[in-house]
């Protein structure tokens, strides 16, 4: 049998190398960059995905006002350190020994420091606000239809339980999706809101992480919903610690 015939691939993560060398000749997949085994029946953690991405060849009014403590990922891509479970390590450092603390979605939450910087714990991001602007349409989408479709998307495509989709707000053309998941709410096996948000972000950008599964086909009552810009805000269980210099910049 060829690999194509056996279809030994990871449907949930195209950034993997798979081979039928698992127990009983079963397909086993490892993330690029880290070489860690991944569970292809669910989403791969954002940390492993970022690490794989960095290792890959380079190519090409009802609306919510984010809190003063909301973080936006302004630092962009970096090659993260992941723990054995695939989560971000609380302290991240670059090759020049510059270090910083991150939250559970890998976004910097302190000023940058040196190797003496301590990050005592990985602080959980418990609230994610996804702010979207959709392309012009003939008319506004029906709010309840839009709400149902986005909840369905997070349940069916990203396997995120609907209870973690706290709200969907809409004021044409702005859509806001609120994801909430406290440490106490997240059971073993539940998809993490940070991972679901990252898969969604990549889908919206036309960079789907799914293997072989088509790109995002988002429709509301048959009408395509096309997103032209995305902003994601992250709120941590413990507010971030930045110096006043940054806050006034």
């Amino acid at each position: 049998h060829t690999a194509a015939q056996d279809n030994c691939t990871c449907p949930t993560n195209k950034m993997t190398v798979c081979s039928p060398d698992g127990p009983g000749g079963r397909c086993q997949c490892r993330a690029l960059g880290s070489g860690m085994a991944v569970d292809c029946s669910t989403l791969t953690s954002k940390c492993l995905l970022l690490k794989a991405r960095m290792s890959a060849p380079k190519n090409a009014r009802t609306l919510v006002r984010p809190s003063e403590h909301a973080l936006v990922d302004n630092d962009g891509l970096y090659d993260p350190d992941c723990d054995p479970e695939g989560r971000f390590k609380a302290r991240q450092c670059n090759q020049t020994s510059v270090c910083w603390c991150v939250n559970s979605v890998g976004v910097r939450r302190t000023d940058k420091g040196d190797l003496s910087l301590r990050c005592d714990e990985l602080v959980r991001t418990h609230h994610i606000l996804i702010d979207l602007r959709h392309r012009p349409t003939a008319g506004a989408f029906n709010h309840s239809d839009l709400d149902a479709e986005l909840r369905r998307l997070f349940r069916e495509r990203y396997r995120l339980h609907p209870k973690f989709v706290a709200a969907v707000h809409y004021e044409q053309p702005t859509i806001q999706i609120e994801l909430r998941q406290n440490t106490s709410q997240k059971a073993a096996g539940d998809v993490d809101i940070g991972d679901a948000a990252y898969y969604f972000e990549r889908d919206i950008k036309g960079e789907s992480l799914f293997q072989g599964r088509g790109g995002l086909d988002l429709r509301v009552r048959g009408e395509p919903l096309q997103v032209e810009r995305t902003l994601i805000y992250y709120l941590d269980e413990i507010p971030p610690k930045f110096s006043m210099k940054r806050l006034t910049a």
Partner: antibody, heavy 116, light 108 residues
């Protein structure tokens, strides 16, 4: 490799309650998947009955909702189906399945006959 | 609820031929939420395709899926003897999953 195994009585009396259990092995029921029941009357097509998440959240097919209860027992890694007030029309092969971008793992099915 | 209608009801073909099975939805279904199954007599169904076009693990590449909106297609490029079975489409784009009534692919 995830495996599912249905068990329960093969014969139920009319107006009685059909009770089946699905044991999950090779994987945890406390995963991001939903767990479904599907049935197939003799010589007919597939009918979805309903499904459950490990926290006990459920979805049921509307026409069966008033008669169906699906429950989960995480300690035993199993989930169960109860269908009340059964008639001959409920005679079918009953399957349990994992719902993960389609039903990717199925039990072998168990035939339940409703007859006095 | 979304009703799925499969056609034809029966397809009579010879091994080596191409099989084209159709599934039409009563209302638009995102292609992310359509699956195809194969069922042989006395066996449980087997997932072939999810997300309208993504082959499930272990499914040979002669099986392919396509379509969007209300029209979806399962194609078997060259029928092998083991492919003669009943095929079902299924949508999971609403909280209530529904199946088509099935297409039987039989030996001519």
């Amino acid at each position: 490799q995830v495996q599912l195994q249905e068990s329960g009585p093969g014969l139920v009396k009319p107006s009685g309650t059909l009770s089946l259990t699905c044991a999950v092995s090779g994987g945890s029921i406390s995963s991001s998947n939903w767990w479904s029941w599907v049935r197939q009357p003799p010589g007919k097509g597939l009918e979805w009955i309903g499904e459950i998440y490990h926290d006990g959240s459920t979805d049921y097919f509307p026409s069966l909702k008033s008669r169906v209860t699906i429950s989960v027992d995480k300690s035993k890694n199993q989930f169960s189906l109860k269908l009340s007030s059964v008639t001959a029309a409920d005679t079918a092969v009953y399957y349990c399945a994992r719902d993960n971008w389609g039903f990717d793992y199925w039990g072998q099915g168990t035939l339940v006959t409703v007859s006095s | 609820d979304i009703v799925l209608t499969q056609s034809p009801g029966t397809l009579s073909l010879s091994p080596g031929e191409r099989a084209t099975l159709s599934c039409r939805a009563s209302q638009s279904v995102s292609s992310s939420y359509l699956a195809w199954y194969q069922q042989k007599p006395g066996q449980a169904p087997r997932l072939l395709i999810s997300g309208a076009s993504s082959r499930a693990t272990g499914i040979p590449d002669r099986f392919s899926g396509s379509g969007s909106g209300t029209d979806f297609t399962l194609t078997i490029s060259r029928l092998e003897p083991e492919d003669f079975a009943v095929y079902y489409c299924q949508q999971y784009g609403s909280s209530h999953r529904t199946f088509g009534q099935g297409t039987k692919v039989e030996i001519k």
